[in-house]
Interface confidence: medium
């Protein structure tokens, strides 16, 4: 059911763009899943607007979202996780716009954490490691990670490395000597589930050794 409000109180609704986007997070709180939706136009007047999800739910036909400032949010165990759900923006009982969405195709993983970089002097390389909560999950276990690093002075010159493991080796000779680097990592579903990049992990900063003049190697 989609359409626009037609009664007198809701005439202004016809002028608004109620486009919205959503992402799901599975087993984000124990066995609880979450679904977060927000309007694409930040200036939409959200007073009296509600979100509702129907279909592909266990035990119930529909669920209402909670409103948290400008986002709408559900935390539940009741997502079926196979099949499309109908997500609607509503004013009272009237649906203003609806989207059919399979929650397994809009998964946003949790951000990786515990990012660290260790310099191995003998190997002349840097070992990057990080952790992800998804290793312990039943559903979204398989992720592709995007490690991005840059020299701190090069504001937009990021180098990206995609990997499926949580460990990466950076060769010393590929980095500038005596430089401060920033590194961060994010994740995206990479098997049965589809969706969006997670938020970036907190950045980690490390300095490369200076060049040893006699050997041409970094200290």
């Amino acid at each position: 059911e989609s359409g626009y409000a037609q009664n007198g109180d809701l005439e202004d609704a016809e002028l608004d763009d109620y486009s919205f986007s959503c992402y799901s997070q599975l087993e984000v709180n124990g066995s609880q899943h979450s679904l977060t939706c927000a309007f694409e136009d930040p200036d939409v007047n959200t007073t009296n607007l509600e979100f509702e999800i129907c279909g592909a739910l266990v035990e119930v036909k529909c669920l209402n979202f909670r409103k948290l400032q400008e986002i709408y949010f559900i935390e539940t165990k009741k997502f079926l996780l196979i099949g499309k759900s109908n997500i609607c923006v509503k004013v009272g009982e009237k649906s203003l716009t609806c989207k059919k969405i399979d929650l397994t195709t809009i998964v946003k993983p949790e951000a990786p954490f515990d990012l660290s970089v260790i310099y191995r002097e003998g190997a002349n390389d840097f070992v990057v490691t990080f952790n992800t909560s998804h290793l312990q999950k039943k559903y979204v276990k398989v992720l592709m990670h995007d490690v991005a690093y840059r020299q701190e002075k090069d504001e937009n010159k990021w180098t990206h490395v995609n990997l499926s493991s949580t460990k990466l080796t950076l060769l010393q000779r590929k980095l500038q000597p005596a430089a401060m680097y920033e590194i961060k990592v994010r994740s995206i579903p990479d098997h049965y589930f589809k969706g969006f990049w997670s938020e970036w992990s907190p950045s980690y900063y490390f300095r490369t050794p200076e060049i040893n003049n006699s050997s041409g190697e970094m200290d």
């Epitope: 266990v58 035990e59 036909k61 079926l80 196979i82 099949g83 499309k84 399979d102 195709t105 559903y139």
Partner: antibody, heavy 121, light 109 residues
């Protein structure tokens, strides 16, 4: 009118293959998971296989795993069951069924009339 | 897959009787249960979903109840057209899996 029409059944020798088809009409096919359910003569219902709307979720009963393959063509509004290495115990009436998960979870709200598969030498 | 056991396997009753069929799950499945009716030579027909919700077009003499492991299908006053075989059904969403009970045959006494 919502309709499912199965075809492709017949008499086949043990070890041979058969492909069942199910033509869907009257509903938005690619919004729904679909299933195959069979019923041996004089026996109860046995779920055989199911496939999600986008073919990414697929399941099989243990009795057919590794021998049967379910697939769908949303452009043709069609569901298929490829049955290999057929055995006498696969003899049954095979139903195609539409999944209506808006009911709250997997419920099979529309069924075809069935197609008969007989495996015998 | 979760095992579903229906009881009785068959029963005889008369028109006007109140009939109860039970379905027991080997482990808790909350309210994720449906009931179907099948008449000889016909495809099954959905009666009840979500343990107690009546499918559109199904007479109100049919009702379902229960949650967890024990579920019941009740026909409050048997009509001649109700003599058939009844099946309960459960699901698992990941991996996708459906299980039927073995069926209960309801015959005219």
């Amino acid at each position: 009118e919502v309709q499912l029409v199965e075809s492709g059944g017949g008499l086949v020798q043990p070890g041979r293959s058969l492909r069942l088809s199910c033509a869907a009409s009257g509903f938005t096919f690619d919004d729904h998971a679909m299933h195959w359910v069979r019923q041996a003569p004089g026996k109860g219902l046995e779920w055989v296989s199911g496939i999600s709307w986008n073919s990414r979720g697929i399941g099989y009963a243990d009795s057919v795993k590794g021998r049967f393959t379910i697939f769908r063509d949303n452009a043709k509004n069609s569901l298929y069951l490829q049955m290999n290495s057929l055995r006498a115990e696969d003899t049954a009436l095979y139903y195609c069924a539409k999944d209506e998960y808006s009911r709250g979870y997997y419920v099979l709200d529309v069924w075809g009339q069935g197609t008969t598969v007989t495996v015998s030498s | 897959a979760i095992q579903l056991t229906q009881s009785p396997s068959s029963l005889s009753a008369s028109v006007g009787d109140r009939v109860t069929i039970t379905c027991r799950a080997a482990q808790g499945i909350s309210s994720a249960l449906a009931w179907y009716q099948q008449k000889p030579g016909k495809a099954p027909k959905l009666l009840i979903y979500d343990a107690s919700s009546l499918e559109s077009g199904v007479p109100s003499r049919f009702s379902g109840s229960g949650s967890g492991t024990d579920f019941t299908l009740t026909i409050s006053s048997l009509q001649p057209e109700d003599f058939a075989t009844y099946y309960c059904q459960q699901f698992n969403s990941y991996p996708l899996w459906i299980t039927f009970g073995q069926g209960t045959r309801l015959e005219i006494k």
